[in-house]
Each structure stands twice: as C-alpha cells, then as structure tokens.
Amino acid sequence: IWELKKDVYVVELDWYPDAPGEMVVLTCDTPEEDGITWTLDQSSEVLGSGKTLTIQVKEFGDAGQYTCHKGGEVLSHSLLLLHKKEDGIWSTDILKDQKEPKNKTFLRCEAKNYSGRFTCWWLTTISTDLTFSVKSSRGSSDPQGVTCGAATLSAERVRGDNKEYEYSVECQEDSACPAAEESLPIEVMVDAVHKLKYENYTSSFFIRDIIKPDPPKNLQLKPLKNSRQVEVSWEYPDTWSTPHSYFSLTFCVQVQGKSKREKKDRVFTDKTSATVICRKNASISVRAQDRYYSSSWSEWASVPCS
Amino acid sequence: RNLPVATPDPGMFPCLHHSQNLLRAVSNMLQKARQTLEFYPCTSEEIDHEDITKDKTSTVEACLPLELTKNESCLNSRETSFITNGSCLASRKTSFMMALCLSSIYEDLKMYQVEFKTMNAKLLMDPKRQIFLDQNMLAVIDELMQALNFNSETVPQKSSLEEPDFYKTKIKLCILLHAFRIRAVTIDRVMSYLNAS
C-alpha cells in the first residue's frame, strides 16, 4: 500500500482465483482513543470501532472511503483505491490502446516546435467517475522540471455503438533551450482513477521525435502569364521555432485532382514557393517537415486551383 | 526521402553543401545499422544516449543563433576563447563567436572520425563480417574537416591489444551513430544559419 496523495492510498493486488488479498490497517488520525467508529463511503452503518480498523482487501468493493467518527463528528478519512495486477501485468482497462505508432500506445504526444512545450492526449470509453493527474520530468534519475496543466476533455466521438472521449494535457519544460541536443528523454506519467480503480500510464520521448509543425500559412497562388503554371507561395507557420534559418523546414507541394484516384503530382522544396501546373478542379496542398530531422509532416494547407 | 538535391551556388557558404552531405551519410549509415543489427538494441528507445564530445567541445553553445542568446536556458555554459579562422569563413567578416563555433564543429568531427576509424578496425576483425562503416560517411567527414581547414594536432587512432568484444562494439556503434546524427543535425542548422547571415 502506498500514498497517492493526502488521505488517498493505493492497494496493489495480485489478481487470481483464491488470492488472499492484502491486509490493511487503517488508523484514525486523531489524539482521541475511545468512542471511535468507522463507516464506509456514504453509509451510516458502523463497520467497527476503535482507533484502528483492520480489513482484508481482495476486490474492488473492499476499497472506498473509510471514515472514522466520534459522537457524530468526522475525525479523518482514508480513501483506498485498487491497482490490479493479473499474470504479472498491471491492468490497462481505463485507457484505449491507440495502436499508433505501435501496440500498447496509450499516450500520444506532439510538439509544434522546439520550445519545450508539448501536448499529450489519450482515449477512453468511460464517461463518468473518472479523474486524471499528470506529472512529467526530463529524465527519471535526477529529474529536471516539466510543468503540466490539468487534463481536460478535448473531444468526443462516436465510434460504432460506443462513444469515445479524448483527454489532453499541455506541458512545458521549465528551462528549455530550443537549440539543445536532448540526451535524456521527457517522461510523462498519467495517474488514472475510475471509481475505485487506479492505473498508471507512462510515455518516454525526445521532443525532436514528436515534432509536428503546424501547416504552412498564407498559401497563395499567382498565375504565370501565358502559361498553365502557377506560382504557389506560403510562409512558415507562426508557431514554428525561430530563427527560421536555423530551424529550417522542408515542404511538400501536391497537386490533387477532384477524384482521389487521379495521379498526384508532388514536388519537394526547401524554398517557400514553387511553380506547378494547375489543372482544372484540382487543389494545391502544401505541408511542412523539419528539414534536418525527419519527424512528422504537418497537416496539409490547401487552396483550390480555380 | 526522395527530395531533389539542389547543387550549391559557387558563391554559397562553402560548408553548407558538405554539412548536408554529412547528415545524409550519417542518416543512411544509421538506417543501415538499425536494419543489419535488428536483434541488437539499436533503436533510439533502446540505447543509452552518450555524447563523446561532452565536456570537450561546446558546439551547441558556441554556435547558438544570436536570436537565442537572450534565452537563459541556452546560456548554461557559453564558452568564449581563442581559435583562428578556417576557410569556410573565406571573404566574410567573421565574428569571434563564429570562429569559435566552427572550431568546435571541427573538433567534434575529429573526435568522431577517430572513434569511427577505431571501431571500423575492430569490425573488420569480426568473423561474422556483419557490418562495417560506410566509407562514404568517413569521406564526407574528411571533406567537411578539410573545408573547415582548422590547424589542429592530429589525434592518433586508438589501438587496443585486447581481443575485441564484437557485441559491445556493435552496440557502441549504434550509440555513436545516434549521437553523431544529432550532432550532424546541429551542424546542418548552424551552416544553414551562417549561410543566411
């Protein structure tokens, strides 16, 4: 058993048939010695009396908020949560496996630049009685500070018969140098509590590997005289690291017909303009990627040819 | 990536072309190592990230873009010392810091060159003959060093009398390639920045 936060404890349980469970002794936080009674959750029925209460925790129903009272007055609370281990593996029932980029990916993170700011998100089908708490650091032994906000519900989607909920959190490395060469990864730890079930999820990454620039901005077309060609121009996204001559991007320009089956013409360039042939009913799209370190491409920015 | 490769203009900052070739060569070598050594811990997640230049050079700090010198997190250990101009600085009014920066890059390349050559000698003794260093990568390091043209003592190649542990050597190769790729990215950024200045 260990303390998650003040008055909240996690009981780690090996889950198998006939498991003996864990004996837990709760002590009422009071100088009083006599006349103490114990209740569980919001029930008024007395479970036991005395300064300590011994319980055998075997399953979820044995957990909950144990309260000690004296003469109708609440003295202290202890909330017990369960962390379940089956066949040596901690349960991962609360979050959905996103399977990208590999199996058992519960947390996904992205950064728009090298400022040390990043966003992580996760999915669940659970809609109520759910809380998350996020901690992060650079490195695990002798960790350096990363500050994370509160996790918030960022999207809801319907997937078949199920509703899916996306939660996200923003974190910022306390003293980040955009030009630094990372040697220690960022560690992100998410504590998830659903009803009386506790689970924890972790992700480890370098900012350079989770970079995904915003799409190029101000995408414009300029027809060239006496030609089917157009000059496409764009700018670096506002959120990209500066100076741009140091944090350079490379671009992919695509001409796509109305039909998805039509052949796509693609040009790669390091410049912020390109000359392409604009077909009728086609659209021109541009996306960006770090020029020197091939992490993710941005989403496309698009304009119609007409 | 199937990018069309632009040939540099003659007037272009001379080292930019070499640094682009360097990054391409080390990325290809790393990819080859990861494929060939697929049953070894050779991915970014599996290896320990070591920097052989740590405490010996200060490329990131010395080559920091002017715009980032206001960022206190970038100024942990800025060095300000000596160094004479190399040929990459040809016909340019070069600041003291720029000379320091390019000299630091040169020292990095020299250290990696020695490590890679020593390692290659060991890998050539491996009866499995599983992996060797790409001669093109070694050549590209050499070319960039020549372009930088700093006067520096030559470091003798390390030789070891003991029987090499090929498993450890291959893991060390992965560690070295990962670190060198990261440094090659920094070098490319620096050259691009200097070219634009």
Epitope: W15, L40, F60, G61, D62, G64, K195 | -
Partner: nanobody, 124 residues
Framework: EVQLVESGGGLVQPGGSLRLSCAAS????????MGWFRQAPGKGLEFVAV????????YYAESVKGRFTISKDSSKNTVYLQMNSLRAEDTAVYYC?????????????????WGQGTQVTVSS
C-alpha cells in the same frame, strides 16, 4: 457484462430456513457490491441485504435483521442469502443484483446487473 443466476428458492413452512445462491460470471471484478432484493405479489421492489466487496461491510433491511445473513465465497464468485425464521411476509420473488456503484447500495436504481429471480414461498 456480468451474468447472475439465482437458485435455492422453494416452498417452506413458517419458522423454516432456506439458502439462496447467486452465481456471478463475466466481468465480476468490476462489481463493488452484490445484493438481494425481493418483490412480493402486487408490491414494489424491496431491499433485503447487500454485501460490499469480499465482505468488508454487510447491510440489511430492518425487517430481516437478525434472521437473514448475506455472505460471499469470492473464489466461487457466489453470494449466499441464509434465511432463517421465515415468515409468511417473506414470500416473494428474490432477485440477486450487482452494482459497480460505491454509493446508495440499498437503492435498486443504482444496480447495473440483475438475475432472473427465484421464488420463495412461506406457507403452512
């Protein structure tokens, strides 16, 4: 999902005893409490007894206190209701129910899963 199957009901004389069983299967580890409710002819659903977890807490309706005992064999995922000193007014269909809710375990509206019920008749 949790499936519940009751057994052990039947006809018994006043003052007699019966033991009801409720076997749970499926995602039983998600359940917080298991309880017994009953419905007499022409009446609403009435709370009888509930057991929390593996038995850290048991709650009873006033009308059955001292006569009925709820217990659980966690290894068999089975909950029992031992009914002694039965009275005619205990005649009802007895339902086993399971909840994933921590609170209001005496209220049938908080229960997620129900068995099909077993008839208990107390008559001479």
């Amino acid at each position: 999902e949790v499936q519940l199957v009751e057994s052990g009901g039947g006809l018994v004389q006043p003052g007699g005893s019966l033991r009801l069983s409720c076997a749970a299967s499926g995602r039983t580890f998600e359940t917080i409490a298991m309880g017994w409710f009953r419905q007499a002819p022409g009446k609403g659903l009435e709370f009888v007894a509930v057991i929390r977890g593996s038995g850290v807490a048991t709650y009873y309706a006033e009308s059955v206190k001292g006569r009925f005992t709820i217990s659980k064999d966690s290894s068999k995922n089975t909950v029992y209701l031992q009914m002694n000193s039965l009275r005619a007014e205990d005649t009802a269909v007895y339902y086993c129910a399971a909840t994933t809710n921590r609170f209001k375990n005496r209220e049938y509206t908080t229960y997620d899963y129900w068995g099909q019920g077993t008839q208990v008749t107390v008559s001479s």
